[in-house]
Amino acid sequence: MMTGTIETTGNISAEKGGSIILQCHLSSTTAQVTQVNWEQQDQLLAICNADLGWHISPSFKDRVAPGPGLGLTLQSLTVNDTGEYFCIYHTYPDGTYTGRIFLEVLESSVAEHGARFQIP
């Protein structure tokens, strides 16, 4: 039975040109995390494999940085980065857990600064 839950940063906003940290945390399970995938609208951004480390998709190499931890840092944000992001935790023996984050990239300094993991 899958008992775990994923906590995420939820809905966050950031300024165009800035950076943001996408962060998820899996709790309430003793399952072993074998890999975390970060996706945006069915596009794979990055993989963090428990044994092998990080793989960043070539098309995102210039703007995506691994970490902190199992999180992902998006840099040089554009308005086109607005949308849903998913952290997909592959675990053993539980299976797959998915968390959702909605990022809004704003044109000016109207970005809210309430996000817990946001880089100022």
Partner: antibody
């Protein structure tokens, strides 16, 4: 040219261990992950695990965990695959294969060794 | 582990035929799908990586398509040297599992 040369055929008794070597040449050894794949007679391909030759990190298929050890010797550009507690079902051709892309693993294996036949028989 | 299912397991075709082999993953693997060709007594050879990218030196009659869970390898005009066994492999999530193989035989 890029080449992987494996050690010769082995005949082992059940319960024994075997260590297969794979010597790389023609490229920067530490920059490419190396995988191991086996093929039992008349059967398909079975992925066993992968090693990062620069840092020595490994990932093993759960089926082989506890029985397989992959290591590397950077001074000789050689990776090793040791399989212990051999049984008859381990009779197979064992291949080493290099990941296609430097410092990454998800894009297939483009260079393969010639294969090492391991026979387990009492 | 992700299961990879290939179909058909074998097929008979003639030189010049268009041949299609399919591979289905038990869960989404994005585009992390590779195709290999293996001839008897030989090591596998990489044909296609990342679902649709042709490996250097591989003839253009080979092509790959698909994403998510459903993938296809197509040989547009089968040549005598193409009679072999073909395997798909997912490389998204360890263990990087293979399909059961498709043997392409001469009709």
């Amino acid at each position: 040219q890029v080449q992987l040369v494996q050690s010769g055929a082995e005949v082992k008794k059940p319960g024994a261990s075997v260590k297969v070597s794979c010597k790389a040449s023609g490229y920067t050894f530490g920059s490419y992950y190396m995988g191991w794949v086996r093929q039992a007679p008349g059967q398909g391909l079975e992925w066993m695990g992968i090693i990062d030759p620069s840092g020595g990190r490994t990932s093993y298929a759960r089926k082989f965990q506890g029985r397989v050890t992959m290591t590397r010797d950077t001074s000789t550009s050689t990776v090793y695959m040791e399989l212990s507690s051999l049984r008859s079902e381990d009779t197979a051709v064992y291949y080493c294969a290099r990941a296609r892309t430097p410092s990454s693993w998800p894009y297939g294996m483009d260079v393969w060794g010639q294969g090492t036949t391991v026979t387990v028989s009492s | 582990d992700i299961q990879m299912t290939q179909s058909p397991s074998s097929l008979s075709a003639s030189v010049g035929d268009r041949v299609t082999i399919t591979c289905r993953a038990s869960q989404s693997i994005n585009s992390y799908l590779n195709w290999y060709q293996q001839k008897p007594g030989k090591a596998p050879k990489l044909l296609i990586y990342a679902a649709s990218s042709l490996q250097s030196g591989v003839p253009s009659r080979f092509s790959g398509s698909g994403s998510g869970t459903d993938f296809t390898l197509t040989i547009s005009s089968l040549q005598p040297e193409d009679f072999a066994t073909y395997y798909c492999q997912q490389s998204l999530l360890t263990p990087f599992t293979f399909g059961g193989g498709t043997k392409v035989e001469i009709k």
